[in-house]
Amino acid sequence: TEVKVIQPEKSVSVAAGDSTVLNCTLTSLLPVGPIRWYRGVGQSRQLIYSFTTEHFPRVTNVSDATKRSNLDFSIRISNVTPEDAGTYYCVKFQRGSPDTEIQSGGGTEVYVLAKPSPPEVSGPADRGIPDQKVNFTCKSHGFSPRNITLKWFKDGQELHPLETTVNPSGKNVSYNISSTVRVVLNSMDVNSKVICEVAHITLDRSPLRGIANLSNFIRVSPTVKVTQQSPTSMNQVNLTCRAERFYPEDLQLIWLENGNVSRNDTPKNLTKNTDGTYNYTSLFLVNSSAHREDVVFTCQVKHDQQPAITRNHTVLGF
């Protein structure tokens, strides 16, 4: 009758931070000699626990190994980290000088389940304009096992990524994912969101989401119109300059009279549209009795540090 080392579980999965028990039982108390636990095989194997007086942080024996009849050499590993992943072997030695390895268990593979970090979505450094194609990147790291699903959505519609990569490609303690998607901007996107959704075995069917608000990545330039209202009195003309459907809010409006600055507006009361864009109306009262000749009035709109948009209007002299 030869001693057998029984490791009943081929594999165990444990969430990072939790503890796990690796079971090992022997069929014999003989021959006399120590039992040791190793991770890995061959020369590079690492001693995890020895049923002696040595102290091993985070690893404890499950049963009282000092009891003469004890055949249970299971261990508990607490506060498991992704670095603890690997195959663990319970090994029986025969006492001698040196001790001789006589039997090993079949091994128990420990899979450490580590949650992916909340996905982070990044977009272009500069705002894009409608009809422009812009790329968004989603990154999540620190997860294990390697299997992971990443999906992109824009306003509820799934988008197909340009590429998705999980690194490293080989076996590792934890993994990272990076995915890039291309979005064609349109003028209605101020209220739109691009969502990166990550699903993993550790997340209990509640995927993690990273969100990019397109309002941070889009510029909608205003449509600028100057109109003349019916005169309220014989010697007064009302000019209106309307900047419509622009985003973001940053707007400067200047009135010029024959090319000379007449008034500087820093808009405060913007009107917000349902699509998230803004409108602004500036009124300019012209005293027509002061003008014998035709006067060219210019409304100059500077939006979000872009080149000025100018619209001219001629008021005929009296």
Epitope: T1, V3, V21, N23, T25, T27, S28, L29, L30, V32, V62, S63, D64, K67, R68, S69, N70, L71, D72, S74
Partner: antibody, heavy 119, light 107 residues
Framework: QVQLQESGPGLVKPSQTLSLTCTVS??????????WSWIRQHPGKGLEWIGA???????YYNPSLKSRVTISVDTSKNQFSLKLSSVTAADTAVYYC???????????WGQGTTVTVSS | DIQMTQSPSSLSASVGDRVTITCQAS??????LNWYQQKPGKAPKLLIY???NLETGVPSRFSGSGSGTDFTFTISSLQPEDIATYYC?????????FGGGTKVEIK
Amino acid sequence: QVQLQESGPGLVKPSQTLSLTCTVSGGSISSGGYYWSWIRQHPGKGLEWIGAIYYSGPIYYNPSLKSRVTISVDTSKNQFSLKLSSVTAADTAVYYCSKEGYHSGMDVWGQGTTVTVSS
Amino acid sequence: DIQMTQSPSSLSASVGDRVTITCQASQDISDYLNWYQQKPGKAPKLLIYDADNLETGVPSRFSGSGSGTDFTFTISSLQPEDIATYYCQQFAYLPWTFGGGTKVEIK
């Protein structure tokens, strides 16, 4: 002082499953480093170890019976149980439950329960 | 499985006699051996553990010795209440196995 008491039907029909329970009093089944065993004794014969459950979890079975035996524990009721399936007349015996002591011997035994397999 | 061979299978001795029972293991079991006494209609009772250690409360006329494959159980002075069957049991290897028993009677 720990005491053990076996309970279960005294008569089982061939091919059926024999089910016995051992109730532990005077101590907790989940404390200390003990084996809780089932042993049987055929009429006029010697003792045969069926199997044991160790306090830390492992269950050990006699290979000659392993395919038919299940030993389990219910810590909430302070009981451990034996199930022996597909019984025949050869399973007629007195069935004992026992507890291993602080040392290695079985120092506490139930009084035994006779199980007869007959149609 | 480890075979435990007990001899004799039965013996008859007078009160006060020294009684010796032997138990032989089919392979080395070190000192992983226990001895039990079973009286008719009763459950076994532990007398000796680890080959030579007397269980608490057991009279000192009972003793055990041996190591490896050969073990001896001795009653130094047989008493009428010692009428019983005695079993050796090894726990070095699974499955644990018992000897066939030695029935002790009074002449």
